[in-house]
């Protein structure tokens, strides 16, 4: 059994999250994850989910009674989601920490916008994808 | 030329983001994007970047002088990053809107944690990936 299971059960007790009523009004994440089978689509969604959990854990960093549980789960997230790659985790953390109200960050973000946009479509690797990408480009209305 | 280019140039003027000094102290996003070539890794990072831009645009939604530019860029992000798939965009938006301080949201998140964690690793599709997954399990320190 993965180590996070026992610690997640511990967090359930702490947050009083084991009761059946918690599931009322639908799920937060599980229903959304069920919608997406493609790996790249799943990563788009999981990226937001993981950043949510890291934010949540940060809010409880001073609560000693759950520190071991939180640390174990974070470590397991690093293994599973970031494939134990510290650089990947660090880059991710940088992105989640940028303040949207910081004027310098705003200016940089707008400065980089054109290049970021140019990279948003998936790289045309497979024959199928290349074809659909080319169709897209062909379909662009001329400005 | 893609429609966002002209509008992004307009935003550069508005944010005074065209000057060379904006690039001082490195980039926000471009350097990070250069680090990741794998499509799934790129999606992890781009997910955070796109949510940053949507938050930024939301902060300026009442500024009429840049509304057309913002709407055109958002539309192009919807086309490029979400592949014109409204459900993908809606699921993404739900995830970005969850409040980490809402007690009910916290309880639900902890309630779903074990299942979310179980799905974090990419499905072991290729031989190489399967092998590295097994190596990982072998390297696990016993708890």
């Amino acid at each position: 059994q993965d180590p996070y299971v026992k610690e997640a059960e511990n967090l359930k007790k702490y947050f009083n999250a084991g009761h059946s009523d918690v599931a009322d009004n639908g799920t937060l994440f599980l229903g959304i994850l069920k919608n997406w089978k493609e790996e790249s689509d799943r990563k788009i969604m999981q990226s937001q989910i993981v950043s949510f959990y890291f934010k949540l854990f940060k809010n409880f960093k001073d609560d000693q009674s759950i520190q071991k549980s939180v640390e174990t789960i974070k470590e397991d997230m690093n293994v599973k989601f970031f494939n134990s790659n510290k650089k990947k985790r660090d880059d991710f953390e940088k992105l989640t920490n940028y303040s949207v109200t910081d004027l310098n960050v705003q200016r940089k973000a707008i400065h980089e916008l054109i290049q970021v946009m140019a990279e948003l479509s998936p790289a045309a690797k497979t024959g199928k994808r290349k074809r659909s990408q080319m169709l897209f480009r062909g379909r662009r209305a001329s400005q | 030329q893609d429609p966002y280019v002209k509008e992004a140039e307009n935003l550069k003027k508005y944010f005074n983001a065209g000057h060379s000094d904006v690039a001082d102290n490195g980039t926000l996003f471009l350097g990070i994007l250069k680090n990741w070539k794998e499509e799934s890794d790129r999606k992890i990072m781009q997910s955070q970047i796109v949510s940053f831009y949507f938050k930024l645009f939301k902060n300026f939604k009442d500024d009429q002088s840049i509304q057309k530019s913002v709407e055109t860029i958002k539309e192009d992000m919807n086309v490029k990053f979400f592949n014109s798939n409204k459900k993908k965009r809606d699921d993404f938006e739900k995830l970005t809107n969850y409040s980490v301080t809402d007690l009910n949201v916290q309880r639900k998140a902890i309630h779903e944690l074990i299942q979310v964690m179980a799905e974090l690793s990419p499905a072991a599709k290729t031989g190489k990936r399967k092998r590295s997954q097994m190596l990982f399990r072998g390297r696990r320190a016993s708890q």
Partner: antibody, heavy 120, light 110 residues
């Protein structure tokens, strides 16, 4: 109330051209992608083309690619479909349709339709 | 190419409940919204369900939409059937570059 009114249909010879227009009202036109859908006599619905809210992205069914051109004039709240090199199999009622999003998305409102007949 | 398959026709008596299915040929039907359109003879289509299960204003709650991931299908259910429900019904989704329609189902109210 959302209203979509198509004009410009009629009888045309094979190889000829026709331009359909769709006048839209009752919503912020530039905020929504628009679509053309057709229905051949006695047949089902077939999607033809779509265009994003700004007009920056366009989409075509394989059956019309290279022959039809979709465009929009957001200042006039009007959608167009330029149909060239028309064939007998293009004979259909053409519906203008509004989608619920700027980049595509579900169709939520339909026009009354306009008959295009391609025949010699 | 992604396709949506519907039964050619269904029939049921007034007051009863009928379900029309729409099955995706590939991928996951849940990865895109499914819409349902009603077309009465000689009229333009109207939307009865959009975004899987949402009803436009003016459409009665007798109409409901659902998604079944296990069978990769969407369903339109009409309860308390009325004679005015007799029409063709089309499902529709999107496959990344095209809007795809099902072949249509003729509903007869007996």
């Amino acid at each position: 109330d959302v209203q979509l009114v198509e004009t410009g249909g009629g009888l045309v010879q094979p190889g000829g051209s026709l331009r359909l227009s769709c006048a839209a009202s009752g919503f912020t036109f530039s905020s929504y992608a628009m679509s053309w859908v057709r229905q051949a006599p006695g047949k089902g619905l077939e999607w033809v083309s779509a265009i994003s809210g700004s007009g920056g992205s366009t989409y075509y069914a394989d059956s019309v690619k290279g022959r039809f051109t979709i465009s929009r004039d957001n200042s006039k709240n009007t959608l167009y479909l330029q149909m060239d090199s028309l064939r007998a199999e293009d004979t259909a009622v053409y519906y203008c349709a509004k989608t619920s999003w700027n980049a595509g998305g579900p169709i939520d409102y339909w026009g009354q339709g306009n008959l295009v007949t391609v025949s010699s | 190419n992604f396709m949506l398959t519907q039964p050619h026709s269904v029939s049921e008596s007034p007051g009863k409940t009928v379900t029309i299915s729409c099955t995706g040929s590939s991928g996951s039907i849940a990865s895109n919204y499914v819409q349902w359109y009603q077309q009465r003879p000689g009229s333009a289509p109207t939307t009865v369900i959009y975004e899987d299960n949402q009803r436009p204003s003016g459409v009665p709650p007798r109409f409901s939409g659902s998604i079944d991931r296990s069978s990769n299908s969407a369903s339109l259910t009409i309860s308390g059937l009325k004679s005015e429900d007799e029409a063709d019904y089309y499902c529709q989704s999107y496959d990344g570059s095209a809007w795809v329609f099902g072949g249509g189902t003729k509903l007869t109210v007996l």
